[in-house]
């Protein structure tokens, strides 16, 4: 058993049918010695008396808010949560496996630049009695500070028969060094509590590996005289790191016909313009990627040819 | 070239070669099935490789003030990786394919390090840790780790030379 926060404790259980569970001793936080009784949750049934209460915690019915009283007055509370270990592996009931980029990916994170700011998100089908707490650091043995905000519900979508809820959090490395080569990964730890179930999820990454630039901005077409060709131009997204002579992007320009089956023409360039042939009813799209490190491409910025 | 006395390197040449290094490093080790190398044990890891750190002056301001600190750091790293790529980690079993980019990568690391330091002038170089994995699978894992680490290193070096070519060339 360990303390999650003041008066909230996590009991770790080896979870299998007929498991013996864990013996837990609760102590009433009071100078009083006599006339103390214990109850669980809203029940008025007295579970025991005395300054300490010894219980055998086996299942969720044994978890909850234990309260010690004296003469009708509440003295203190202890909330017991359960953390299930199933055959040596901590349970992952609360969050959905996003399966991208690999199985057992519960947390996904992205950064728009090298400033040390990043966003993480996760999915669940649970709509109520759910709380999250997020901590982060650079490295784990001698951790350097990363400050995370509160996790918020960022999207809801219907998937088949049930609803899916997306939560996200923004974090910022306290002393980021955008130009340095990272040697210690960022660690992100999410505590999830659903009713009386506790779970924790972690992710470890380098900012360089989660970079995904915003799409190029101000995408424009300039027809070239007496030609089917057009000059496409664009600019670096505002959110990308500066100076651009140091934090350079490379670009992919694509001409795509109306039908998805039509052949796509693609051009790669380090410049912020390119000359392409504009077909009728086609659209021109441009996306960006770090020039020197193959992290994710941005989403496409698009304009119609006409 | 970064000659004794601290004159400027051939920024544009360095830029071209460092960008080529980035391409080679990624073709030598693309993201193989998203193998998470940080999860793959640290018993024979590449933690001892030289990293371009915050105080090494490789940021735009540091380069403007005095690029020599940064160039020395990059040179150290180039020599370090050049030696690693020439070691039995890469020459031993399992043999690299004949058309593997590792050979080109090795030669380009040497080429860029020579651009930065002509003969007769010596910056101190970092000692290579004695990494001699016994099993072929350990060697394979170490190759992946070294190449992933090299990708990060040459990305920073390429940024330095791109910025230098754009802003510090005479």
């Amino acid at each position: 058993i360990w303390e999650l926060k003041k008066d909230v404790y996590v009991v770790e259980l080896d979870w299998y049918p007929d498991a013996p569970g864990e013996m837990v001793v609760l102590t009433c936080d009071t100078p009083e010695e006599d006339g103390i009784t214990w109850t669980l949750d809203q029940s008025s049934e007295v579970l025991g008396s005395g300054k300490t209460l010894t219980i055998q915690v086996k299942e969720f019915g044994d978890a909850g808010q234990y309260t010690c009283h004296k003469g009708g007055e509440v003295l203190s509370h202890s909330l017991l949560l359960l953390h299930k270990k199933e055959d040596g592996i901590w349970s992952t009931d609360i969050l959905k496996d996003q399966k991208e980029p690999k199985n057992k990916t519960f947390l996904r994170c992205e950064a728009k630049n090298y400033s040390g700011r990043f966003t993480c998100w996760w999915l669940t089908t649970i709509s109520t009695d759910l709380t999250f707490s997020v901590k982060s650091s650079r490295g784990s043995s001698d951790p350097q500070g990363v400050t995370c905000g509160a996790a918020t519900l960022s999207a809801e979508r219907v998937r088949g028969d049930n609803k899916e809820y997306e939560y996200s959090v923004e974090c910022q490395e306290d002393s980021a060094c955008p130009a340095a080569e990272e040697s210690l990964p960022i660690e992100v730890m999410v505590d999830a509590v659903h009713k009386l179930k506790y779970e924790n999820y972690t992710s470890s990454f380098f900012i360089r590996d989660i970079i995904k630039p915003d799409p190029p901005k101000n995408l424009q077409l300039k027809p070239l005289k007496n030609s089917r060709q057009v000059e496409v131009s664009w600019e670096y997204p505002d959110t990308w790191s500066t100076p651009h002579s140091y934090f350079s992007l490379t670009f992919c320009v694509q001409v795509q016909g109306k039908s998805k089956r039509e052949k796509k023409d693609r051009v790669f360039t380090d410049k912020t313009s390119a000359t392409v042939i504009c077909r009728k009813n086609a659209s021109i799209s441009v996306r960006a990627q770090d020039r020197y490190y193959s992290s994710s491409w941005s989403e496409w910025a698009s304009v119609p040819c006409s | 070239r970064a000659v004794p006395g601290g004159s400027s390197p051939a920024w544009t040449q360095c830029q071209q070669l460092s960008q080529k290094l980035c391409t080679l490093a990624w073709s030598a080790h693309p993201l193989v099935g998203h193998m998470d190398l940080r999860e793959e044990g640290d018993e024979e890891t590449t933690n001892d490789v030289p990293h371009i750190q915050c105080g090494d002056g490789c940021d735009p301001q540091g380069l403007r003030d005095n690029s020599q600190f940064c160039l020395q750091r990059i040179h150290q790293g180039l020599i370090f990786y050049e030696k690693l790529l020439g070691s039995d980690i890469f020459t031993g079993e399992p043999s690299l394919l004949p058309d593997s980019p590792v050979g080109q990568l090795h030669a380009s690391l040497l080429g860029l390090s020579q651009l930065l330091q002509p003969e007769g002038h010596h910056w101190e170089t970092q000692q290579i840790p004695s990494l001699s994995p016994s099993q072929p699978w350990q060697r394979l894992l170490l190759r992946f780790k070294i190449l992933r680490s090299l990708q990060a290193f040459v990305a920073v070096a390429a940024r330095v030379f791109a910025h230098g070519a754009a802003t510090l060339s005479p």
Epitope: W15, P17, E59, G88 | -
Partner: antibody
Framework: QVQLVESGGGVVQPGRSLRLSCAAS????????MHWVRQAPGKGLEWVAF????????YYADSVKGRFTISRDNSKNTLYLQMNSLRAEDTAVYYC????????WGQGTMVTVSS | QSVLTQPPSVSGAPGQRVTISCSGS????????VKWYQQLPGTAPKLLIY???QRPSGVPDRFSGSKSGTSASLAITGLQAEDEADYYC????????????FGTGTKVTVLG
């Protein structure tokens, strides 16, 4: 004491269907994940499928994906395996078992796929 | 196709010590715990070892398990006639859990 009893096995022709049941008693069935494991005659153990305690997630071996469906009815304390498009290579003893460090197995039910 | 490899058979005289190996990789045994089962002819598997080296109550202390790196082993000391059975190791893969990975199985024969 935990008890698992499989039923529903038998002889079936290739391409046909069969539904296996596993009746659980002696524990809070709705709190635990459950597996189906099979063993072809004279062969080793092969995992078939898993279902979470609440039925929210199901996992299958590649060899049965798209043909077999695992389900559970927690109100009846029963686990099911719906087997469609049966093949000769599905011939085996099918066991249900609880998920956890200390597991409990049923006695098994024999499924024979033969023309 | 099992990814946990065991020897097809091992044998020993009564009273002897035999060991069964179970070889996996970093993503399965290297990252997860190992169980061992005993299966007597015509019966369901019986748990012998869990969490690499723990014995459930009722299992004789002649059976012991260990794990090192990407391999695990089961040792039977003071071999007895009733130990003649098939033995299976089981683990999980880091990326496919909760799918069970079983070893190929080992037939233990008690000689004489």
């Amino acid at each position: 004491q935990v008890q698992l009893v499989e039923s529903g096995g038998g002889v079936v022709q290739p391409g046909r269907s069969l539904r296996l049941s596993c009746a659980a008693s002696g524990f809070t069935f709705s709190s635990y994940g459950m597996h189906w494991v099979r063993q072809a005659p004279g062969k080793g153990l092969e995992w078939v499928a898993f279902i979470r305690y609440d039925g929210s997630n199901k996992y299958y071996a590649d060899s049965v994906k798209g043909r077999f469906t695992i389900s559970r009815d927690n109100s009846k304390n029963t686990l099911y395996l719906q087997m469609n498009s049966l093949r000769a290579e599905d011939t085996a003893v099918y066991y249900c078992k609880t998920h956890g460090s200390h597991d409990n197995w049923g006695q098994g039910t024999m499924v024979t796929v033969s023309s | 196709q099992s990814v946990l490899t065991q020897p097809p058979s091992v044998s020993g005289a009564p009273g002897q010590r035999v060991t069964i190996s179970c070889s996996g990789s970093r993503s399965n045994i290297g990252s997860n715990t190992v169980k061992w089962y005993q299966q007597l002819p015509g019966t369901a598997p019986k748990l012998l070892i869990y969490y690499n080296d723990q014995r459930p109550s009722g299992v004789p202390d002649r059976f012991s398990g260990s794990k090192s790196g990407t391999s695990a082993s089961l040792a039977i000391t003071g071999l007895q006639a009733e130990d003649e059975a098939d033995y299976y190791c089981q683990s999980y893969d880091r990326y496919t859990h909760p799918a069970l990975l079983f070893g190929t199985g080992t037939k233990v024969t008690v000689l004489g």
